[in-house]
Structure formats: structure tokens, C-alpha cells
Interface confidence: medium
């Protein structure tokens, strides 16, 4: 399987909410011996590998924001901690998963990465990630609502195993 990032750039005004999205592509095993761990973190565009650096989102680590479930089950973070920081991650039955960030500030600007770890019990794990940029703007040049820019088809599937 791969991870697609439908949008590579989100440009939002300060104070707005935004939902960053990733999507699982390809066959997803729904058997009992497979679970998925999905999470989010901030990163920087490394020279070697984008998303290799894991930085917290609003002081919350990727462990704090993760979802852990089987196949295409739906899930969302029940962490009070995340919600207190204006964050919520969620996953649906169709392979989409997202993080919603409320009341954006300029400090939220940066590169965001989604990470999916497929754990095949008794065997191994397979990791893929996707990256997208969030730009939070203020002043007269800021849009009134979030504007999203689609990834090129090459970008959205150019995903490297972590």
C-alpha cells in the first residue's frame, strides 16, 4: 500500500481551522493479523529524506496523536490532551485519515507529515509517510478561508517507506 496526500499545500488565515488529510491507497489487508498505526508530526524538508525528523505538533508528540486499529476501521483520538491543544486526528472506513487543527496561529506554519505503520503480526511492519505544507497568513494578503493546492499525481504517490 501507499499513502497519498491529496493536497500538498494549505494556505489558511490566522484563527481558522484546517483539516490536513492523507489517504491509504492500494490493497489494505483487513485480516485479524494486521493492524494500522496512523499518526502525525511536524518535520522539515531534510536533504536526505523528507519526514525523517519528528517534531511535536503544538507540544504533542506523534505518540500522543496516534490512532491504532485494524483494517479500514474508523477511529479518532479520544485524547483529552489533544483536544485541549485544539487537535484531533481521525480515520474513516475508506482509508482517509486526517488531523484537524483549530484556531490556527502563525506558529502552526510548517511541514506536516502523516505516518502509517502496517503491523503484520508475527512478521514485520511496513511504514509509509506523506508530507504537506501549511502556511498560516495574517493581514490583508491572507485568504478569508483556507485555500488548498492539489498535489501533482507524481507527488501524491511519491511516498517513501520510512
Amino acid at each position: 500500500f501507499k499513502v497519498a496526500t491529496p493536497y500538498s499545500l494549505y494556505v489558511c488565515p490566522e484563527g481558522q481551522n484546517v483539516t490536513l488529510t492523507c489517504r491509504l491507497l492500494g490493497p489494505v489487508d483487513k485480516g485479524h493479523d494486521v493492524t494500522f498505526y496512523k499518526t502525525w508530526y511536524r518535520s522539515s524538508r531534510g536533504e536526505v529524506q523528507t519526514c525523517s525528523e519528528r517534531r511535536p505538533i503544538r507540544n504533542l508528540t506523534f505518540q500522543d496523536l496516534h490512532l491504532h486499529h485494524g483494517g479500514h476501521q474508523a477511529a479518532n483520538t479520544s485524547h483529552d490532551l489533544a483536544q485541549r491543544h485544539g487537535l484531533e486526528s481521525a480515520s474513516d472506513h475508506h482509508g482517509n485519515f486526517s488531523i484537524t487543527m483549530r484556531n490556527l496561529t502563525l506558529l502552526d506554519s510548517g511541514l506536516y507529515c502523516c505516518l502509517v505503520v502496517e503491523i503484520r503480526h508475527h512478521h514485520s511492519e511496513h511504514r509509509v509517510h506523506g508530507a504537506m505544507e501549511l502556511q498560516v497568513q495574517t493581514g490583508k494578503d491572507a485568504p478569508s478561508n483556507c485555500v488548498v493546492y492539489p498535489s501533482s499525481s507524481q507527488d501524491s504517490e511519491n511516498i517513501t517507506a520510512a
Epitope: T35, S52, E53, R54, T61, Q63, H68, E125, A162
Partner: antibody, heavy 116, light 107 residues
């Protein structure tokens, strides 16, 4: 084959800095997190901290003010530094590579005694 | 920090007995709990992860269950080689935390 080996002085004086190295092989340093865990003699396991892929760190607040975990990719080594040690820091220190999202592959551990 | 409270701290059982060790988390950790076995003088070895999945090579007599805050490790038929200390660990959030351990002996 994943291998980790801790090394460093077996004896450290109180108030000095404990410095340990974890030399790894069989995997890429840039792809996995490494935790340091310790076990005082006859006691339980205590997680010290982690260095994530890309070099970010997260430390147990019990050690926060005196611990540093770093990586030297050119030498395939991770290091742990713990300053201002006391006798309570006497323990077997383990480095462990994550897999399945938890510490999975452990080194053999190295005993560090803090004594004058 | 999440506290992991293990019980009992020690127990003695006979070969063939069914043995149960419990672990209680101070807050919800989902199924992000592992169990390790540590034999005297040896490195901890992973037995169970994701609360109920046996790691590769672990005998089928070991099983794990639970979610949320209450977790159990069960040895269905105790063998002499199972003498060890067993630790639960949560990896739901940092800092990773371990239970204080359960020392298992043979009667």
C-alpha cells in the same frame, strides 16, 4: 541481523557525567528510534529517553535537566550523557531499537556503578 | 505520566498451573501495552505487544488480553523455563512507562 552494543566506563564518580555509547549494526540509523532504558540492581526497568529519526529527542521528566541523547551517523553510534550522577544512578543501562512501535531489539546492557 | 501498576509483585506456582499477572494503567492507553520476560542476568524479551499479540517465537502458552486500563498476561500451563520477572509497559504516550515487575517462581 539487528545488533546493539552498549559501552562505556563501568565506574563513575559522584557529581561527574556518565557517558555511554550504543554501537549498532544491521539497520539504518535514520529509520528507527533508539531508546535508553536502565535497571538499578534488583529493581525494575526505567525509560530514560528516546532519539527519533531525524535527531529529535524526548526525555523522561525525571532525567530532563541532566540527560542528553545524541547520534553520530558516521560512526553508527548513539550516545547517552547523564550529568551530576549519584549512587542512585547505579544501574545496568540498555539501548534498544524500536520495532512494532516499542523497544524491541535490546543491547546486552552495561553496568555503571557510581562510587567514589 | 502514566503509571502502570502490576500485581502481584511476586508469585509462586507449580508446573502445569495457570498463572495470571495483571497490570492497571492510570489512564486509558488503548491496546498499546507490551509484556516482557526477563530471566535472571538476561536482557528483557518481548512476549506480547498490542495487548494481545504474541511476538514471533513466543510459545502459545503465553497470551495477553485487555484494553483501556486493565491488562492481563496469562501462562496457560507453567513450565520450569518460565521462571523470570515479567514487566508490562505502555507505549501509548511519552514517557514510556513500565510496571514494577512480577517475579515468578516455581513451587
Amino acid at each position: 541481523q539487528v545488533q546493539l552494543q552498549e559501552s562505556g566506563p563501568g565506574l563513575v564518580k559522584p557529581s561527574e557525567t556518565l557517558s555511554l555509547t550504543c554501537t549498532v549494526s544491521g539497520f539504518s540509523l535514520t529509520n528507527y528510534d533508539i531508546s535508553w532504558i536502565r535497571q538499578p540492581p534488583g529493581k525494575g526497568l526505567e525509560w530514560i529517553g528516546v532519539i527519533w529519526t531525524g535527531g529529535g529527542t524526548n526525555y523522561n521528566s525525571a532525567f530532563m535537566s541532566r540527560v542528553t541523547i545524541s547520534v553520530d551517523t558516521s560512526k553508527n553510534q548513539f550516545s547517552l550523557k547523564l550529568s551530576s550522577v549519584t549512587a542512585a544512578d547505579t544501574a545496568v543501562y540498555y539501548c534498544a531499537r524500536e520495532g512494532l512501535l516499542l523497544p524491541l531489539y535490546w543491547g546486552q546492557g552495561t553496568l555503571v556503578t557510581v562510587s567514589s | 505520566d502514566i503509571q502502570m501498576t502490576q500485581s502481584p509483585s511476586s508469585l509462586s506456582a507449580s508446573v502445569g498451573d495457570r498463572v495470571t499477572i495483571t497490570c492497571k494503567a492510570s489512564q486509558n492507553v488503548g491496546t498499546n501495552v507490551a509484556w516482557y520476560q526477563q530471566k535472571p542476568g538476561k536482557v528483557p524479551k518481548l512476549l506480547i505487544y498490542s495487548a494481545s499479540y504474541r511476538y514471533s517465537g513466543v510459545p502459545s502458552r503465553f497470551s495477553g488480553s485487555g484494553s483501556g486500563t486493565d491488562f492481563t498476561l496469562t501462562i496457560s500451563s507453567l513450565q520450569p523455563e518460565d521462571v523470570a520477572t515479567y514487566y508490562c509497559q505502555q507505549y501509548n504516550s511519552y514517557p514510556l512507562t513500565f510496571g514494577q515487575g512480577t517475579k515468578l517462581e516455581i513451587k
